[in-house]
């Protein structure tokens, strides 16, 4: 089976470099839930952390990145069962001996308080009340995010300069 | 450091479920290269496969998914140095004993011909002329893709039903 790739209904000139930004995402896509400046999608199936990351990626989104305690609380308020847990985009970097968000930034010590081991193959999930670490191979639900980027951002990340 | 998250310049009602689709992506974002129905971004730095996947995800994109030999050829034509290789969104699933795209579909036997071992921790990269497998921990460049989805797709994937 080939990767499912959306076909285009118009003739687009091949190999043309565009310098316009992506369109502003003013509303969330269907099935996504708007929470402040983000669109969130809570999975109904379970996956290891890595597959969860891949799933968000193929949806052109990211595993959830949490800015601060307020955002954590807002997200946890959407979890209606104490027993359900969701992977987020944070795991332990063995080489840097620190918790690292998938966007490359490190966890600030005064942000989330993680219960559990900080060791190789530890990934982070949230429940209704807490933030935990667990083996990344554990299969659980996950949350994808898309940002409602209403302010255009022309800055190119380091890895693309 | 907190995860870098774009802030919104307008007041958006919290916790409101939208049922509109994402806006049509008619042009590629700045720095991205348009190739038929996709926007591609070729990294300039190197990363293990997993970090490459994470990077694309935080850019709300996917590691490259290749539909067929024609798309492979088109992409390889953009690689101007025979010695440079790029991770794509394909790795070996040990449990399923098959090459698996990150969107969950399997490699069709008559699609890409992969040179190298099909074993645990094997990921796939492309060069100007070939498709190879390599340990996923190897650091190399990678390609992200965004689809130019001009046809709205309302179908919800299984994992979100």
């Amino acid at each position: 089976q080939k990767p499912s790739i959306g076909k285009c209904s118009v003739d687009i000139q091949q190999n043309r470099t565009k310098t316009t930004e992506r369109p502003d995402l003013l509303n969330c896509p269907i099935y996504w839930q708007q929470v402040q400046e983000k669109c969130l999608l809570f999975s109904h199936t379970v996956n290891p952390w890595n597959n969860s990351l891949a799933d968000c990626s193929t949806k052109e989104s990211s595993l959830l990145l949490i800015q601060d305690k307020d955002e954590l609380t807002r997200t946890q308020n959407l979890i209606h069962d104490k027993a359900i847990s969701f992977w987020i985009g944070l795991n332990f970097s063995l080489s840097e001996k620190n918790w690292k968000w998938i966007n490359g930034s490190f966890l600030s010590s005064n942000d989330l308080k993680i219960t559990g081991d900080a060791k190789e193959n530890s990934c982070v999930y949230i429940s209704q009340t807490s933030v935990y670490s667990e083996y990344c191979s554990t299969e659980m639900k996950w949350i994808c995010q898309k940002e409602l980027t209403l302010v255009r951002n022309k800055v190119s990340p380091d890895s693309w300069l | 450091q907190k995860p870098s998250i774009g802030k919104c310049s307008v007041d958006i009602q919290q916790n409101r479920t939208k049922t509109t689709e994402r806006p049509d992506l008619l042009n590629c974002p700045i720095y991205w290269q348009q190739v038929q129905e996709k926007c591609l971004l070729f990294s300039h730095t190197v990363n293990p496969w997993n970090n490459s996947l994470a990077d694309c995800s935080t850019k709300e994109s996917s590691l490259l998914l290749i539909q067929d030999k024609d798309e492979l050829t088109r992409t390889q034509n953009l690689i101007h140095d025979k010695a440079i290789s790029f991770w794509i969104g394909l790795n070996f699933s040990l449990s399923e004993k098959n090459w698996k795209w990150i969107n969950g579909s399997f490699l069709s036997s008559n699609d890409l011909k992969i040179t190298g071992d099909a074993k645990e921790n094997s990921c796939v990269y492309i060069s100007q002329t070939s498709v190879y497998s390599e340990y996923c921990s190897t650091e190399m460049k990678w390609i992200c893709q965004k689809e130019l989805t001009l046809v709205r797709n309302k179908v919800s994937p299984d994992s979100w039903l």
Epitope: V46, K82, Y135 | -
Partner: antibody, heavy 122, light 108 residues
Framework: QVQLVESGGGLVKPGGSLRLSCAAS????????MSWIRQAPGKGLEWVSY????????AYADSVKGRFTISRDNAKNSLYLQMNSLRAEDTAVYYC???????????????WGRGTLVTVSS | DIQLTQSPSSVSASVGDRVTITCRAS??????LAWYQQKPGKAPKLLIY???SLQSGVPSRFSGSGSGTDFTLTISSLQPEDFATYYC??????????FGGGTKVEIK
């Protein structure tokens, strides 16, 4: 309806083997951690083994490690326990149990079968 | 391994009584604790998970509390169908998932 039905129990001699099966119905079997739990006659409950939804992750109690093998076939909605080198102390009712979904490896058993009796005796 | 000690091992009570069963863990387990009810010849039934969350379909006379090492299951007003054996279970994320020794609730 949502249920689990075990089979395969019986009388076996010490050192012998048995294969237990658990047929699931009424729910999406492939999305749940599944376990085997046993209860010796007149005794308490003892967790034996679990398997993750995909089958990629497995764990065993020390008392059965190296002798028992858990497996699953999601296409057939079935869970299995291959028991080798059986001992008298393995005599118990063996229950197949489903975990609450998405608690990771924090396994709360929300659905149980009726159990199948395994008797190891010469 | 984490040990769970239940007390009492048995309790005699009458219909309408308030019954309290305790479970003590040998080390802190946060709120990773469940309570089950088992009747003779039947499979156990999940009553409480995450120390205090009532499982769907379970009567509200059952409640759980506690965190860390000390946990309690309370039946606010004992009903005839509640005479059974009750087990606590710790579910910290690394096996084995140990059960308490059980508490038998008998008719006085």
């Amino acid at each position: 309806q949502v249920q689990l039905v075990e089979s395969g129990g019986g009388l076996v001699k010490p050192g012998g083997s048995l294969r237990l099966s658990c047929a699931a119905s009424g729910f999406t079997f492939g999305q749940y951690y599944m376990s085997w739990i046993r209860q010796a006659p007149g005794k308490g409950l003892e967790w034996v083994s679990y398997i993750s939804p995909s089958g990629a992750t497995i764990a065993y109690a020390d008392s059965v490690k190296g002798r028992f093998t858990i497996s699953r076939d999601n296409a057939k909605n079935s869970l299995y326990l291959q028991m080798n080198s059986l001992r008298a102390e393995d005599t118990a009712v063996y229950y197949c149990a489903r975990s609450l979904m998405s608690t990771g490896t924090h396994l709360y058993f929300d659905l149980w079968g009726r159990g199948t009796l395994v008797t190891v005796s010469s | 391994d984490i040990q769970l000690t239940q007390s009492p091992s048995s309790v005699s009570a009458s219909v309408g009584d308030r019954v309290t069963i305790t479970c003590r863990a040998s080390q802190g387990i946060s709120d990773w604790l469940a309570w089950y009810q088992q009747k003779p010849g039947k499979a156990p039934k999940l009553l409480i998970y995450a120390a205090s969350s009532l499982q769907s379909g379970v009567p509200s006379r059952f409640s759980g509390s506690g965190s860390g090492t000390d946990f309690t299951l309370t039946i606010s007003s004992l009903q005839p169908e509640d005479f059974a054996t009750y087990y606590c279970q710790q579910v910290t994320s690394f096996p084995p998932y140990t059960f308490g020794g059980g508490t038998k609730v008998e008719i006085k």
